[in-house]
């Protein structure tokens, strides 16, 4: 099975205990580690931060102790904007420009493959960004030579079912894919304005259309219907949680929300905890499970956070493992307990390393 | 600036062995395959063996298949091509090349060369 | 493994352009990048174009890469010839296991 981990960049800014560079990572617990994000300037595969260059470095030499690990450099993300990565796939000259930077980029930082992070093409960009894919590993099949192995090509896919319809075409972009992320969590938000987790394994009793799709099990049988082959797809599990604010003394699923969770230490987002802030934040806590959907939920105060434990992930590890997927992914391990300070468990990565165990075990 | 300096090459007896070395420095060595390419006097190029960026894979030309093995050590930043039962039809000139990340030799050794005569 | 045939040699005057060609005796030409190589006499190779049709920085724009499918061939052309450009051109190809050079064309400048 595959373990796609991801990490990133922005995380070296965290505070103290919070940052976290590519040499704190365990270069045996991953099969793939996926540097996010690079940028595109000037129709050209670019660094984002100051010292990516640095860090690049960094992250691949982990391979020289393990030759088996591979590494992606992620392309794109929520900050670089789907507008700009629309008009590069839109016009033929930028997509070429584009396609040919990529190849010596990687080669020369010593990655092993790009993926595509394109959050999200809009309707009119479903047929550009197939169009992307397919021009893209034409190209990683003429450059790879003798002592060059194929560049690998993957992308990280929404898991929700409005955004699959409008911005891919399933079985025509898996073609052309290594694999796919499907990116299964953040399916509830504080737009709903109730309290729910955000990385369900199965549908909620309660749930109505739309949230009937707001689930993994959904998302990943919805993906397969679609073309897209089990063996290619790699499910995505969070190493973080979302949080809410309750607006009444009401504290279980569904629950109203003033709004997003108060911001977290180290992480400083509203609304995200880290894995190794829920487990600061689990301390004087009340634990919860949500039986039908898999995982588990605390509050403490005023504070609600669905997230996912070593339990959550073993479950769905033995999901992925039941429906034949070719394995899991991980966003992020510098979210997850990468010192192995915070749980108490004196072990580093400790959801990561629950999902290696769980791929592992026959 | 990538410099490849290759070492190693002389005169010697048909079925002799030699080791020919290229030591490689500007640039991160471990990220690029290398490559060992030849040419007989007054004749063409010939591409003789290539070795992966972790040394993982190699692959030889049919004519040198099963004498000659190409090696790396990527913490001397140095690439190795072993030539056993050495011909008279291995005399050539040998380049040490750098598997570019654009052209796909895009540094090349200043060449070493070996004859092969009894 | 395949082949690349190339012209043993051509020649013209400073000034005029010269073609060369490299055709490959089996597979498709378009299935694998083309370069090609500058050697001038007692020198090291150095690359005039890669992948095709693309110029190392420092490559005069007189040089110039084409392929062409239906003579399953592909091209280097010498504009404005130059006295500096006398040489011998080799183009190379591979496959997932080889790398192959062309035979080699002595470009000779006249006068």
């Known amino acids: 099975y595959k373990l796609v981990c991801y990490y990133t960049s922005w995380s070296q800014y965290r505070e103290g205990d919070g940052s976290c560079f590519p040499d704190a990572l365990d270069r045996f617990l991953c099969t793939h580690i996926i540097y996010s994000f690079a940028n595109i300037s000037n129709d050209h595969i670019d660094t984002w931060e100051w010292n990516d260059v640095t860090l690049y470095g960094m992250l691949n030499t982990l391979k020289n102790r393990n030759p088996n690990l591979k590494t992606l450099l992620s392309v794109g993300g929520w900050n670089f904007g789907s507008q700009r990565f629309s008009k590069i796939a839109s016009n033929t000259q930028s997509r070429r420009t584009f396609i040919k930077s990529v190849p010596p980029f990687l080669r020369t930082h010593g990655f092993d493959g790009l993926d595509l992070a394109w959050l999200y093409p809009g309707r009119r960009d479903k047929q550009h960004f197939t169009t992307l894919i397919k021009e893209m590993k034409a190209e990683f099949i003429k450059e790879a030579q003798p002592g060059k192995k194929q560049l690998l090509l993957s992308a990280a896919l929404s898991a929700g079912k409005v955004t699959i319809d409008s911005s891919y075409d399933i079985a025509k972009i898996s073609q052309h894919l290594d694999f796919i992320s499907i990116m299964t969590y953040d399916f509830h938000g504080a737009w709903r304005g109730t309290t729910g987790h955000h990385s369900p394994l199965f549908r909620g009793q309660e749930d109505a259309s739309p949230d009937r799709f707001s689930n993994t099990d959904y998302a990943v049988g919805y993906m397969l219907r679609l073309g897209a082959p089990a063996s290619k797809l790699v499910m995505g599990i969070p190493t973080f949680g979302r949080s809410f604010t309750l607006a009444s003394s009401e504290t279980g699923v569904g629950a109203p929300i003033s709004g997003p969770g108060i911001p977290g230490r180290f992480t400083k987002e509203a609304g995200t905890l880290a894995y190794y802030e829920i487990c600061d934040f689990l301390r004087g806590a009340t634990v919860h499970r949500i039986l039908g959907q898999q995982v588990p939920y605390a509050t403490k105060g005023n504070q609600w956070v669905g997230y996912d434990d070593q339990e959550s992930v073993k479950s769905k590890v033995q999901y992925l493992k039941d429906r034949q997927l070719a394995g899991a992914m991980v966003w992020a391990l510098d979210l997850d307990d990468f010192q192995g300070s915070f749980c108490g468990q004196d072990l580093r990565f400790p959801l990561t390393n629950a999902i290696k165990d769980a791929l592992a075990a026959t | 600036e990538v410099q490849l300096l290759e070492s190693g090459g002389g005169l010697l007896q048909p079925g002799g062995s030699l080791r020919l070395s290229c030591a490689a420095s500007?640039?991160?060595?471990?990220?690029?395959?290398m490559t060992w390419v030849r040419q007989a006097p007054g004749k063409g190029l010939e591409w003789v063996s290539t070795?992966?960026?972790?040394?993982?894979?190699?692959f030889y030309a049919d004519s040198v298949k099963g004498h000659f093995t190409i090696s790396r050590d990527n913490s001397k930043d140095t690439v190795y091509l072993q030539m056993n039962s050495l011909r008279a039809e291995d005399t050539a000139v040998y380049y040490c090349?750098?598997?570019?990340?654009?052209?796909?030799?895009?540094?090349w050794g200043q060449g070493s060369p070996v004859t092969v005569s009894s | 493994n395949f082949m690349l045939t190339q012209p043993h040699s051509v020649s013209e005057s400073p000034g005029k352009t010269v073609t060369i060609s490299c055709t490959r005796s089996?597979?498709?030409?378009?299935?694998?990048?083309v370069q090609w190589y500058q050697q001038r006499p007692g020198s090291s190779p150095t690359t005039v174009i890669y992948?095709?049709?693309?110029?190392p920085s420092g490559v005069p724009d007189r040089f110039s890469g084409s392929i062409d499918s239906s003579s399953n061939s592909a091209s280097l052309t010498i504009s404005g010839l130059k006295t500096e450009d006398e040489a011998d051109y080799y183009c190379?190809?591979?496959?997932?296991?080889?790398?192959?050079f062309g035979t080699g064309t002595k470009v000779t400048v006249l006068g």
């Open positions: 992948e095709d049709n693309q110029r």
């Open positions: 500007g640039l991160t060595f471990r990220n690029y395959a």
């Open positions: 089996s597979g498709s030409i378009a299935s694998n990048y």
């Open positions: 190379q190809s591979y496959d997932s296991s080889n790398y192959v």
């Open positions: 070795i992966s960026g972790n040394g993982d894979e190699t």
């Open positions: 090349a750098k598997g570019g990340h654009y052209s796909f030799f895009d540094s």
